[in-house]
Interface confidence: low
């Protein structure tokens, strides 16, 4: 490999180096290639130089398109028609010169926050771009459509939020955001223009025409009006709250809906239980007061005895299924009819048939096993289902089974 | 059982990036907000960050935001936290929590935690 | 920030309650938890979150509330093995915080 490689001069964008050759090993050198690495970079990257070709009687080049401020190392890979070499031990570690940054801070945005407060946020400036000590922020702002900005200093270079809190912002009104950046050198550019609303108001009115229905034991649906009277303050969506009435209100679980869907559906509840529920219209800024608090029951559970005596048998291409009526339970819901569900053994998705009856015939290829089971249904949803029943592959066209 | 296990911290340099690694078990991961939480020598529990059930929602402390990233693995049972640019400051025990509610979140809703990894930013 | 007072002491069998103030309406509540820490480094217990929920392996000597922008931990009839400093937790307006800390001394 060459000998390490020298760092005989530095700038902030630029190295200049030089090398000795190694060994050609009874080839000659034909090129070579520049190697740099920093702190940030992932592993030796080849890097650009002039001259752009370094052929194998050159022993100097200047590195370009260096960051500033970077500490760097270099080295360099000999080539020759026999392939590439090993690369030179490291120069030592230098860091190039300060320079003014150019780089601006990202997704500069914003908006939320308290009353009366404009939240201006962004991405910070990798380390590696800062390109000199005393990094910062310049954050300016105005409200839209004004002539003079508004500046604030941050002298962080993790600074990646700014709030302006002043009794004069107006909730949820436009202005132009732009950040830009310092560091020891000077100042350097601003991001471009964004607009950023300041802090909204929360939702000043409750929604209305609340109604709550049970779908089964375990689900409810709630259906609301959008607030009836004037309201202040953008609604972003709504928050259902429910609890349990020998609950207290404020263990009360809560669901959100996005946008300007009035319904939602509660799920997972309990069977035969008295429920209270409340909506509220939400914002960044937070909730708007309570509707009115309505209440329903959830029906009652379904079955919980699952299907027994259970007899199958088959002829002519069908499975007959005979079973005995499930009873509800007085606290259960009456059973409306059965839901007989059936898949191939190979297969993975169910297919279900529905009936009032306590028998069902099925038309089903002889060629597959069977896996069926069956449960009631109800009001109050699916009750319990029997064991799998396992119908193997049927050769002769009678068969029987329980 | 609910089991929280951080990775070893260990010996970190100033400048440089700290990775945290916690495996869950004992519950639906997928479905719980998960949290770092550390702790100085000698001080309080200071909130670092909290990533959502989904993966989709992140929030920071201001001490670290910019500098760290949270992120979870569903199928891995695993959540990650990133810390560049260390500083002496973020010395200290590193603890793994998780929300008690699938539908709460927030310091105000942790209900388990791991025993805590330290780590400790010094050249 | 979340304030809570520095210390307080109480004689077993005594009721001991540990407040914690600062927190901000957030998203429809002010809520707050509360986490014990026998030792330092050792791994803090939640003995109570979202104000007043206990952890199914928490006695219930425990108990919380929230009201307004307060939080309260009330320990009923406290014990020597309750002596730990306890954390609150909550929202303070721009952030999820925890309170400096509270160390319960039993006499």
């Known amino acids: 490999p060459p000998e390490a490689v020298t760092i005989d001069e530095i700038t902030d964008t630029t190295a200049q180096l030089s090398w000795r050759p190694g060994p050609d090993n009874h080839s000659p050198i034909t090129m070579y290639v520049i190697q740099a690495r920093t702190p940030f970079s992932v592993g030796w990257q080849a890097v650009s130089t002039v001259p752009e070709l370094i052929d194998g009687k050159t022993f100097t080049a200047t590195v370009v398109g260096l960051n500033p401020w970077v500490e760097y190392e270099f080295r360099t890979v000999a080539a020759n028609v026999i392939g590439i070499g090993e690369p030179s031990r490291p120069s030592e570690k230098r860091r190039t010169e300060e320079a003014l940054p150019e780089v601006t801070p990202a997704n500069v945005s914003g908006g939320g926050g308290s009353k009366s407060e404009l939240v201006i946020t962004w991405e910070t400036v990798p380390e590696e771009l800062q390109n000199g000590r005393g990094f910062g922020y310049v954050v300016a702002f105005r409200p839209y459509g004004k002539m003079i900005w508004m500046l604030t200093v941050l002298a962080s270079a993790d600074a990646s939020r700014y709030v302006f809190r002043n009794e004069s912002v107006h909730p949820f009104s436009p202005f132009e955001v732009k950040v830009g950046v310092f560091n020891n050198k000077g100042e350097g550019p601003f991001s471009p223009t964004t607009v950023v609303y300041s802090a909204e108001e929360e939702p000043t009115k409750p929604p209305a025409s609340i109604f709550a229905r049970s779908l089964s034991a375990t689900d409810i649906e709630v259906f609301w009006a959008s607030p009836l009277e004037k309201n202040r303050g953008r609604i972003q969506g709504y928050e259902v709250k429910y609890w349990r009435h020998e609950d207290k209100e404020e263990n009360a679980r809560k669901i959100r809906t996005v946008g300007n869907q009035t319904s939602t559906k509660i799920t997972n509840l309990k069977g035969s239980v008295l429920y209270h529920l409340a909506v509220k219209a939400y914002n960044s800024a937070g909730t708007g007061p309570s509707s009115a608090t309505v209440n329903v029951t959830t029906r009652k559970p379904p079955p919980s005895q699952p299907p027994g005596n259970i007899i199958w048998n088959s002829s002519d291409s069908k499975i007959i299924l005979n079973w005995d009526q499930v009873k509800a339970l007085d606290n259960e819901s009456e059973v409306k009819g059965y839901k007989v569900l059936y898949r191939w053994n190979r297969q993975s998705s169910t297919s279900v048939i529905e009936t009032n009856k306590t028998s069902v015939e099925l038309s089903l290829p002889f060629d597959e096993d069977y896996i069926i089971e069956i449960k009631p249904f109800s009001d109050g949803g699916d009750g319990s289902s029997s064991e799998q029943i396992r119908i193997p592959k049927i050769s002769n066209a009678y068969a029987r089974g329980s | 059982a609910v089991t929280l296990d951080e990775s070893e911290g260990g010996l970190q340099t100033p400048g440089g990036a700290l990775s945290l690694v916690c495996k869950a078990s004992?519950?639906?991961?997928?479905?719980?907000?998960m949290f770092w939480v550390r702790q100085a020598p000698g001080k309080g529990l200071e909130y670092v960050a909290e990533?959502?059930?989904?993966?989709?929602?992140?929030w920071y402390a201001p001490a670290v935001k910019g500098r760290a990233t949270i992120s979870r693995d569903n199928g891995q049972s695993t959540v990650r936290l990133q810390l560049n640019n260390l500083r002496a400051e973020d010395t200290g025990t590193y603890y793994c929590?998780?929300?008690?509610?699938?539908?709460?979140?927030?310091?105000?809703?942790?209900?388990?935690w791991g025993h805590g990894t330290e780590v400790i930013v010094s050249s | 920030a979340l304030t809570q007072p520095s210390s307080v002491s109480a004689n077993p069998g005594e009721t001991v309650k540990i407040t914690c103030s600062g927190g901000t309406y957030s998203y429809g509540n002010y809520y707050y938890g509360w986490y014990q820490q026998k030792s330092p480094g050792s791994a803090p217990v939640t003995v109570i979150?979202?104000?007043?929920n206990r952890p199914s392996d928490i006695p219930s000597r425990f108990s919380g509330s929230g009201s307004g922008s307060t939080g309260t931990l009330t320990i009923t009839g406290v014990r020597a093995e309750d002596e730990a400093v306890y954390y609150c937790g909550g929202y303070d307006g721009s952030t999820d915080v925890f309170g400096a800390g509270t160390t319960l001394t039993v006499l």
């Open positions: 990533i959502s059930g989904g993966g989709g929602s992140t």
């Open positions: 929590a998780k929300s008690a509610d699938t539908w709460s979140y927030g310091a105000a809703t942790i209900d388990a």
């Open positions: 004992g519950f639906t991961f997928s479905s719980f907000n």
């Open positions: 979150y979202n104000n007043n």
